[in-house]
């Protein structure tokens, strides 16, 4: 994946008089790309899905959660090379018999077409064009996500 | 400020060991990858290896089997573990720091490490 | 595994242009980013180029990279040559098991 990448910085708004402030990610930082209120990091290394997840967590980040075919077009358009594949944070649920975000939310089968078997040990990976099944021993790039969050929320003493 | 300090080097004898640490400040050390890169004096930068944020690690041809790099991130520290040192280790060893990939946007001042009988 | 070459030595006028290539031996040039390096005597080095063409916050804009898939190679730019450039300027990437690779490094001497 070879995408131009905004230079941006992380800045915590002080807390003001008469405004609460919750701490949070403002502008993404330098390396992350932002895609509408998320920051995207795209590996450049490869490692299986559970060493992805895990590096995804030590950056304050989790594997990418794509909300709806809209986001997953969008986050496609931003890899460059056909051929690489990007884990993202969904797998297989064998309890369950379903497919799992990392958040906990099942997958809704309307909003990816995945490529591949729904089976024990299987993760999910997308490509410039497609999305895949694959065994999550598979060492493949990944994408982490942050959530941006709003400036700030003002709170007005009672009248 | 992001700082990387090296230390350990020193002169050692061919088939000797060596540990190198690599302390680190002004940053969140256990989201960053990390990377050791020698450099023998008057020569090119090569690397040694890497270590990921969830403990995986990497290493090249040329130290396989005789080094171990590990990481301490309630010290902010990494370690650069050398046995079986040959002449041709004889360098100085950068600790680096990695926010993604190769990427090394910080490196350390280096410290000597000498092989030689 | 591959190999990055770079020529050993280039020199320039200062106020000119000089351009440091790069040679990927085998597989694409594009399927990794490459960095760029700047080590002047006696210092560590610097990045000055990442992900083949971004330039860190500190760099002067006289510092530019690019890849060129024809020739399989990342060339590094600098514009506008002042002394202070003089220096060794390496390329890095890493290969398909991140395992990363350095060239071998260019000597800029700026006359």
């Known amino acids: 994946q070879k995408s131009s990448i905004e230079k941006c910085s992380v800045d915590i708004q002080q807390s003001r008089n008469k405004t609460t402030e919750r701490p949070g990610l403002l502008n993404c930082p330098i390396y992350w790309q932002q895609l509408r209120e998320k920051c995207l990091l795209f590996s450049h290394t490869v490692n299986p899905w559970n060493n992805s997840l895990a590096d995804c967590s030590t950056k304050e980040s989790s594997l990418l959660l794509i909300r709806d075919k809209d986001e997953l077009i969008h986050t496609q358009n931003l890899i460059r090379d056909k051929a690489i594949l990007f884990w993202i944070g969904l797998n297989f649920s064998l309890s369950e018999k379903n497919w799992k975000w990392i958040n906990g939310s099942f997958l809704n089968s309307n909003d990816l077409e995945i490529r591949g078997d729904a089976k024990e040990n299987s993760c999910i990976s997308i490509s410039q064009t497609s999305v895949y099944s694959e065994y999550c021993s598979t060492e493949i790039r990944w994408i982490c996500q942050k959530e941006l969050t709003p400036v700030r929320n003002k709170v007005y003493p009672d009248s | 400020e992001v700082q990387l300090v090296e230390s350990g080097g020193g002169l050692v004898q061919p088939g000797g060991s060596l540990r190198l640490s690599c302390a680190a400040s002004g940053f969140t050390f256990s989201t960053y990858d990390m990377h050791w890169v020698r450099q023998v004096t008057g020569k090119g930068l090569e690397w040694v290896s890497t270590i990921g944020t969830a403990g995986d690690t990497k290493y090249s041809g040329s130290v396989k089997g005789r080094f171990t790099i590990s990481r301490e991130n309630a010290k902010n520290s990494l370690y650069l573990q050398m046995h079986s040192l040959r002449v041709g280790d004889t360098a100085v060893y950068y600790c680096?720091?990695?926010?993604?990939?190769?990427?090394?946007?910080?490196w350390g001042q280096g410290t000597l490490v000498t092989v030689s009988s | 595994n591959f190999m990055l070459t770079q020529p050993h030595s280039v020199s320039e006028s200062p106020g000119k242009t000089v351009t440091i290539s790069c040679t990927r031996s085998?597989?694409?040039?594009?399927?990794?980013?490459v960095q760029w390096y700047q080590q002047r005597p006696g210092n560590s080095p610097t990045i000055v180029i990442y992900e083949d063409n971004q330039r860190p916050s500190g760099v002067p804009d006289r510092f530019s990279g690019s890849i060129d898939s024809s020739s399989n190679s990342a060339s590094l730019t600098i514009s506008g040559l002042k002394t202070e450039d003089e220096a060794d300027y390496y390329c890095q990437s890493y290969d398909s098991i991140n395992h990363v690779v350095f060239g071998g490094g260019t000597k800029l001497t700026v006359l």
């Open positions: 085998s597989g694409s040039i594009a399927s990794n980013y």
């Open positions: 680096t720091r990695a926010p993604v990939g190769a990427i090394s946007d910080y």
